[in-house]
Interface confidence: low
């Protein structure tokens, strides 16, 4: 067989679909690999061929498009399952070719089972809602192209296992689910079940997403440095270990990069010769506000080190702040025992 541009197995597009539901899968060649679309390819005389490798097999097989009720079919650059079966799981290849040109890509398709409460191994998209922010909506995802606009499907929304009806602050509105005022108690998995008729049959599409209620931009503030602060002095003798925590609170901000770093005498620790280590830990509140702690550690501090300037810096999309730690050398205590002994001797 002649050479073919083989893009290999595109594991970035791990496609998961539910058993016993329709699935429409576009050939990834036109979306991610080639600079032209299916219509252009088709009008240029190129043919799109599909085949697959079953799970735990090496043999590439043609796809059977002659199953009862056209269970598997191809329409333009889309492979259709009406509906899927568990043993449709495997690696699917779409190949575009004519006598002089060939390009192909494979992708994994996993048909997964769900239980009666929509629990499954499906990786769920996460939709973030701002806490107490006014009306916000989520939309039933990935249902475009399954039925024409003339078909009016029925849509049922669930939170976990339970049909959403008479909920205090969550209202189903067709393909949308409206949250009147999002609260922490709204965290959870939400499922829309879209039911539509086609050629005398009824099909269901199940789509689950995770709602996470996060801090509102109305409440967002620049980073707050809790430590170091003016109340704590790091007083050490040479030879002791110096530990200074830099603890910074960051409000949740969508797509913000939160950064914390130390400078010693105005330089990054990597750029100086002191034997310094920095350990970072991160914790999150229920609304995904973030607290980052970076502990600066010098195992055996010298008197020179105790004269340096140690500054904690923090930055987010809301701004940049810095705070110096108060570091000083401990003054040796007077030797009272000797002085007192002398005093007693004098009486």
């Amino acid at each position: 067989s002649e050479r073919c541009d083989d893009w290999g197995l595109d594991t970035m597009r791990q496609i998961q679909v539910f058993e016993d539901e329709p699935a429409r899968i576009k050939c990834p060649l036109f979306e991610h690999f080639l600079k032209f679309n299916y219509s252009t390819a088709h009008s240029a005389g190129l043919t799109l061929i599909w085949y697959w490798t079953r799970q735990d097999r090496d043999l590439e097989e043609p796809i059977n498009f002659r199953l009862p009720e056209n269970r598997i079919s191809k329409e333009k650059d889309v492979l259709w399952f009406r509906p899927t079966l568990l043993n449709d799981t495997g690696n699917y290849t779409c190949m575009l070719r004519n006598t002089t040109y060939c390009s192909k890509v494979a992708f994994p398709l996993e048909v997964v089972q769900k239980d009666s409460c929509f629990n499954s191994p499906m990786k769920l998209p996460v939709h973030k809602l701002y806490i107490e922010y006014g009306i916000q909506r989520i939309t039933c995802p990935n249902v475009d192209g399954y039925f024409p606009s003339s078909v009016k499907p029925t849509i049922t929304w669930y939170m976990g296992c339970y049909k959403i009806q008479n909920f205090n602050n969550v209202i189903p509105e067709g393909m949308n689910l409206s949250f009147l005022i999002a609260l922490i108690s709204n965290n959870g998995n939400y499922t829309c079940v879209v039911t539509y008729p086609e050629n005398g049959r009824t099909f269901h599409l199940t789509r689950t997403l995770t709602v996470k209620v996060v801090g509102s931009p109305k409440n967002a503030v620049p980073p707050v440095i809790h430590s170091p602060n003016d109340h704590v002095v790091y007083e050490k003798e040479p030879g002791e270990e110096l530990l200074i925590p830099c603890t910074v609170y960051f409000s949740f901000l969508m797509d913000s990069r939160n950064e914390v770093w130390w400078t010693i005498d105005g330089k990054k620790p990597d750029d100086i010769t002191i034997d310094v280590t920095i350990n970072e830990s991160i914790s999150h509140s229920r609304t995904e506000d973030e607290t980052r702690t970076q502990i600066l550690s010098i195992k055996k501090v010298t008197s020179e080190d105790l004269k340096r300037s140690y500054v904690c810096h923090a930055r987010s999309a809301k701004g940049e702040v810095a705070k110096a730690a108060k570091v000083k050398q401990k003054v040796p205590a007077p030797r009272y025992t000797v002085e007192l002994a002398c005093g007693f001797g004098a009486t």
Partner: antibody, heavy 116, light 111 residues
């Protein structure tokens, strides 16, 4: 653990509230269901309160039975319009999760007798 | 309303034998089915959920199968302690009805 209380002899029409007290169970993470069993008969599902506080009941129980979270450790079953046919042992049970439907930890039950 | 029908109502088998109990749902409930064991004077004990998943601590002599409307509970290598009444329960919820309905029960006598 799960423990039911409040079962007693009542006359027809008397309202009655049963209480389910849990220990070692976070009601924010588990749904709680009520099931009853008439003497010598099978199990009959009454309803469930989900972890987020919503009540779902079997169609036959609509209007007469209400489940609510009374506190962080108690779930109440309020019953009205009782008739002798409601005589049964009433069980409270923990759902396997927030809303799986299956019940994995049961109390010993409390007996309600409706008689004139 | 959804109806769960259990058969047989009663069955008798010797120690070491195998008992098969069937449960039929009046509508498709996927794998939304649980099985319970109840001994006299005691509350029910969850054996199987999700039609075939063994609850923790349940011996592997118990097994469940089925999907949709037809379900089976099999108890093999019967022991005298398996004498009890067994119930199936629908745990499936859909837009038209809430799950929870129990089957009528099957009394298992071990001889």
């Amino acid at each position: 653990s799960v423990e039911e209380s409040g079962g007693r002899l009542v006359t027809p029409g008397t309202p009655l509230t049963l209480t389910c007290t849990v220990s070692g169970i976070d009601l924010d993470n588990y749904a709680m269901g009520w099931v009853r069993q008439a003497p010598g008969k099978g199990l009959e599902y009454i309803g469930v309160i989900s972890s987020d506080g919503f009540f779902y009941d079997a169609s036959w129980a609509k209007g007469r039975f209400t489940i609510s979270k009374a506190s962080s450790t108690t779930v109440d079953l309020k019953m009205t319009g009782l008739t002798p046919e409601d005589t049964a042992t009433y069980f409270c049970a923990r759902d396997r999760g927030t809303s799986t439907g299956s019940l994995d930890l049961w109390g010993q039950g409390t007996l309600v007798t409706v008689s004139s | 309303a959804l109806v769960m029908t259990q058969t047989p109502a009663s069955v008798s088998e010797p120690v070491g034998g195998t008992v098969t109990i069937k449960c039929q749902a009046s509508e498709n409930i996927g794998n939304g089915l649980a099985w319970y064991q109840q001994k006299p004077g005691q509350p029910p004990n969850l054996l199987i959920y999700g039609a075939s998943t063994l609850a923790s601590g349940v011996p592997s002599r118990f097994s469940g199968s089925g999907y949709g409307t037809e379900f089976t509970l099999t108890v093999s290598d019967l022991e005298s302690g398996d004498a009890a009444t067994y119930y199936c329960q629908c745990t499936y919820w859909n837009p038209d009805y809430i799950g929870g309905a129990f089957g009528g029960g099957t009394e298992v006598v071990v001889t």
